[in-house]
Interface confidence: low
């Protein structure tokens, strides 16, 4: 929008709100809001809230992902969690006396129940709750590879902490691999980083639900805090829709050609689902900071302009040397929501819903 | 630009070309193209070309960095390389018989010559040329911390290779730390990943300029292939200009608020410096694929539109639910250039010069 025109802020906000109405429905592949007739009254089940909070925590702990999103990533993801195989299972027997590592096993049939086909999996995270600790330790994560071999996945430097904290590891590739194999028990190993010179290779970090209980520790409520896999996947019915519908093309050099780039400002806009959209069907959250971009991005280069005067303006107004710069989002963040389909609560994550910053582009 | 209007493609290209003229000069903080009077004739010195090629390789091997760029990052970076202290230096004496690691030491006074002040450093990479190898090995990089301690920096899984290949590690933080300390010798350790169970902790990877020469290997030409630090820094004179000029604000939630987002196409545009800009002062490259974005991004949501018809269009035309979507770059890449200042050739990298893909935003 040009600076010379008076901007009707309320109109811009209204347009953004109505665009969001369509965005949410389209991300959920809904032609209209779901019927509210059969929604159970009262608070959401604890397990659903725990799942929603896990998703919310994931969003809070991450920076926006500005990668171009493939078509499948545009649509909402169903979020589920698969708990680690119970510690009483015989599979843990031979791992009991190893001081440098702890082990977590998962049943791939439980995973397959949540994600029937490997390509549907969008993201898988291994979540571990680390208990409070006064020592710093460098730890590593491995994947069970064959009978007695382990494949390195990643590492983390864990600093002392006064409170329990959740650790998250991206294990999308590993879980997709498991889904491509037959059913069975698969696992991870969480180890001390063993140095070439050091003799003390003991794992000092304690993980809730694995490490021996300390006196005075409370048992975990409904096992909510034992290690689990947080899975985000495209529901099967939505995936079928995906294959049949016209594909969205990746807008890169392989396909087509064109450019613009520039800096401006992000304006605050809170969307209250009930008040702004007239929706009661989204149970959590009640609303969110959608925000929007607005502001001038003048094209500031012309042959007759004195170089020295104009050069200082480039950085702010047209860093991408665009032919017609305009004000757009730079960093976007996802939004997890809880809603009902019939009597069944669902946790879904909608990508690129929250505008965190803008630029002239 | 609206679909209803006929787009004058030549005019758009002209505007983009003129914008690029200003962009390059402004990134280099030049009020006008440098004088060509004293430029030495003939080919560029080998060291300058090697440096330019290192920078070019870095660009090719990396995806665009879509992070919001701080003010200093907008401007061009001078690229220099600092070679590892010669292997004949006595400092390597005590490291000779260690089988699990190789060591690389650097003189901080050499680094300080290239980067007089720590904040000027934009990026530092440790570059190692790995010789051909038939084994897979998990390796780790450490920084010399105090007399006998090493701080873990990162790891890499090296797969077998038939040809020598360059490895690159981001060591920006480490080099900045060295610059904040006094002059002296600092170093890195490149080690086998030592497993808690494994007994074979030997480093099988061979690094050019460090590992013992194999029969038939040629000596490295001018030591170009021994480990080095690739440094990108804001030149001192440009930095002083930075401090004195009006600062560009980071356009994120810390500073301001506003929104737009949507999909379109990237158009091909090759800039020939001599032909399109009338410039002879850029020695390498002769031109580059700048490209630009163009295409309609209709606002496709309104209260009276039938939901089902419109929802399918969201993904392509307004994924960010913008109030006024427009066509902008999505992925941008930098451009390294070689030019002369007086009789001195300079290698600089200009950020966000090449448009790789677009989106409606």
């Amino acid at each position: 929008l040009s600076t010379s025109k008076t901007i009707d802020m309320e109109l811009v906000k209204r347009k953004r709100i109505e665009a969001i109405r369509g965005q949410i429905l389209s991300k959920l592949r809904l032609a209209s809001p779901p019927s509210q007739g059969e929604v159970p009254p009262g608070p959401l089940p604890e397990a659903v809230l725990a799942l929603y909070n896990s998703t919310r925590d994931r969003v809070a702990g991450e920076s926006a992902d500005p990668e171009p999103e493939p078509e499948a990533d545009y649509y909402a993801k169903e979020v589920t969690r698969v708990l680690m195989v119970d510690r009483n299972n015989a599979i843990y027997e031979k791992t009991k006396d190893i001081s440098h590592s702890i082990y977590m096993f998962f049943n791939t049939s439980d995973i397959r129940e949540a994600v029937p086909e490997p390509p549907l999996l969008s993201r898988a995270e291994l979540r571990l709750q680390r208990l409070k600790s006064s020592v710093e330790q460098h730890v590593e994560l491995y994947q069970k590879y064959s009978n007695n071999s382990w494949r390195y996945l990643g590492n983390r430097l864990l600093t002392p902490t006064d409170t329990p904290e959740w650790l998250s590891f991206d294990v999308t590739g590993v879980v997709r691999q498991w889904l491509n194999q037959g059913d069975g028990i698969q696992g991870f190993r969480f180890s001390a980083h063993c140095s070439c010179d050091s003799k003390d290779n003991k794992l000092h970090v304690e993980i809730n639900g694995i490490s021996p209980k300390r006196r005075g520790d409370l048992g975990t409520i409904h096992d909510m805090n034992r290690p689990f896999l947080l899975l985000m996947a495209t529901p099967l019915e939505r995936a079928q829709h995906l294959h049949s519908s016209r594909h969205r093309r990746a807008l890169d050099t392989n396909y087509c050609f064109s450019s613009t780039e520039k800096n401006c400002c992000v304006r605050q806009l809170y969307i209250d689902f009930r008040k702004d959209l007239g929706w009661k069907w989204i149970h959590e959250p009640k609303g969110y900071h959608a925000n929007f971009c607005l502001g001038p991005c003048p094209y500031i280069w012309s042959l007759d302009t004195q170089y020295s005067k104009v050069l200082a303006l480039y950085n702010q107004h047209n860093p991408g040397a665009s032919a017609s710069p305009c004000c757009v989002p730079q960093a976007l963040e996802p939004l997890p929501i809880v809603y009902y389909v019939g009597r069944k609560p669902k946790v879904e994550q909608l990508s690129n819903m929250i505008v965190r910053s803008c630029k002239c582009s | 630009l609206s679909t209803s209007k006929t787009i004058d493609m030549e005019l758009v290209k002209r505007k983009r070309i003129e914008a690029i003229r200003g962009q390059i000069l402004s990134k280099l903080r030049l009020a006008s193209p440098p004088s060509q009077g004293e430029v030495p004739p003939g080919p560029l010195p080998e060291a300058v070309l090697a440096l330019y090629n290192s920078t070019r390789d870095r660009v090719a091997g990396e995806s665009a960095d879509p992070e919001p760029e701080p003010e200093a990052d907008y401007y061009a970076k001078e690229v220099t390389r600092v070679l590892m202290v010669d292997r004949n230096n006595a400092i390597y004496e005590k490291t000779k018989d260690i089988s699990h690691s190789i060591y690389m030491f650097f003189n901080t006074s050499d680094i300080r010559e290239a980067v007089p002040e720590p904040p000027l450093l934009s990026r530092a990479e440790l570059r190692l040329q790995r010789l051909k190898s038939s084994v897979e090995q998990h390796v780790e990089l450490y920084q010399k911390y105090s007399n006998n301690s090493w701080r873990y920096l990162g790891n890499r899984l090296l797969t077998p290779t038939d040809t020598p290949e360059w490895l690159s590690f981001d060591v920006t933080g480490v080099v900045r730390q060295w610059l904040n300390q006094g002059d002296g010798i600092q170093g890195f350790r490149f080690s086998a990943h030592c497993s808690c169970d494994s007994k074979d902790n030997k480093l099988h990877v061979e690094i050019n300029g460090i590992s013992p020469k194999r029969r038939g290997d040629l000596g490295t030409i001018h030591d170009m292939n021994r480990p080095f630090l690739l440094l990108m820094a804001t030149p001192l004179e440009r930095a002083q200009h930075l401090h004195s000029s009006r600062h560009r604000r980071a356009l994120d939630t810390n500073y301001c608020f506003s929104s737009t987002e949507k999909n379109c196409c990237v158009r091909q545009l090759y800039i020939d410096f001599r032909k399109d800009l009338g410039w002879k002062w850029i020695h390498e490259p002769k031109g580059y694929h700048a490209n630009f974005c163009l295409g309609p991004c209709p606002y496709i949501w309104s209260l009276d539109t039938q939901y089902s018809k419109v929802l399918a269009l969201y993904n392509q035309h307004n994924p960010g639910a913008s109030a006024s979507p427009c066509c902008v770059p999505q992925a941008l890449e930098p451009l390294p250039i070689v030019y002369y200042v007086g009789r001195k050739p300079k290698v600089e990298q200009l950020s966000n010069m090449i448009v790789r893909s677009c989106k409606c935003s």
Epitope: C265, V266, Q268 | F257
Partner: antibody, heavy 121, light 107 residues
Framework: EVQLLESGGGLVQPGGSLRLSCAAS????????MSWVRQAPGKGLEWVSA????????YYADSVKGRFTISRDNSKNTLYLQMNSLRAEDTAVYYC??????????????WGRGTLVTVSS | DIQMTQSPSSLSASVGDRVTITCRAS??????LNWYQQKPGKAPKLLIY???SLQSGVPSRFSGSGSGTDFTLTISSLQPEDFATYYC?????????FGGGTKLEIK
């Protein structure tokens, strides 16, 4: 001169009502969101309520929700706070504050001198 | 609700001292944090908004930093008129909440 002037405070019994007013001058009143912030004797600041420039959106602290109503009359450049079912814990100095949200942040850039509300039997 | 915790609750310092007051949010609030100064019997006055932006007319000895959950207000060289109570406030979400205040007294 840019200023805010509160009025309407006083002594009221528990369960009673009171209406506070805030007269604005020196700036375009309808362009700014406005807010009420209170401070109990010897205590810290507590946000009470806010209203958008047009009056279309209102916000309340949980402690006053359902009892207090914020409103504005842009033609009179005046902000109001209707307080019903008052309790002893509502005793405080009530400040009227202008909200600057031009950069997308909400911050109170202009404050009135405050008016004292005492709830006591 | 987002809780804002200020520390210390009171602080004694001398003219010319460098003083730092911290504010911690119970959850990440990005940079939606403001700082106010209040003198006895007076209304609060805005010093810093958006974590680090100095309000016009406020002396440059005041500065703010931080983002996420941890924030600081720094007075580089205390002046006699700076002895007052300082409050932080988040505007990330409603209800808007203030810290408990830090009373800065003359040593």
């Amino acid at each position: 001169e840019v200023q805010l002037l509160e009025s309407g405070g006083g002594l009221v019994q528990p369960g009673g009502s009171l209406r506070l007013s805030c007269a604005a001058s020196g700036f375009t009143f309808s362009s700014y969101a406005m807010s009420w912030v209170r401070q109990a004797p010897g205590k810290g600041l507590e946000w009470v309520s806010a209203i958008s420039g047009s009056g279309g959106s209102t916000y309340y602290a949980d402690s006053v929700k359902g009892r207090f109503t914020i409103s504005r009359d842009n033609s009179k450049n005046t902000l109001y706070l209707q307080m019903n079912s008052l309790r002893a814990e509502d005793t405080a100095v009530y400040y009227c504050a202008r909200v600057d949200s031009s950069g997308g942040y909400w911050y109170f850039d202009l404050w009135g001198r405050g008016t004292l509300v005492t709830v006591s039997s | 609700d987002i809780q804002m915790t200020q520390s210390p609750s009171s602080l004694s310092a001398s003219v010319g001292d460098r003083v730092t007051i911290t504010c911690r949010a119970s959850q990440s609030i990005s940079s939606y944090l403001n700082w106010y100064q209040q003198k006895p019997g007076k209304a609060p006055k805005l010093l810093i908004y958006a974590a680090s932006s100095l309000q016009s007319g406020v002396p440059s000895r005041f500065s703010g930093s931080g983002s996420g959950t941890d924030f600081t207000l720094t007075i580089s060289s205390l002046q006699p008129e700076d002895f007052a109570t300082y409050y932080c406030q988040q505007s990330y979400s409603t209800p808007l909440t203030f810290g408990g205040g830090t009373k800065l007294e003359i040593k």
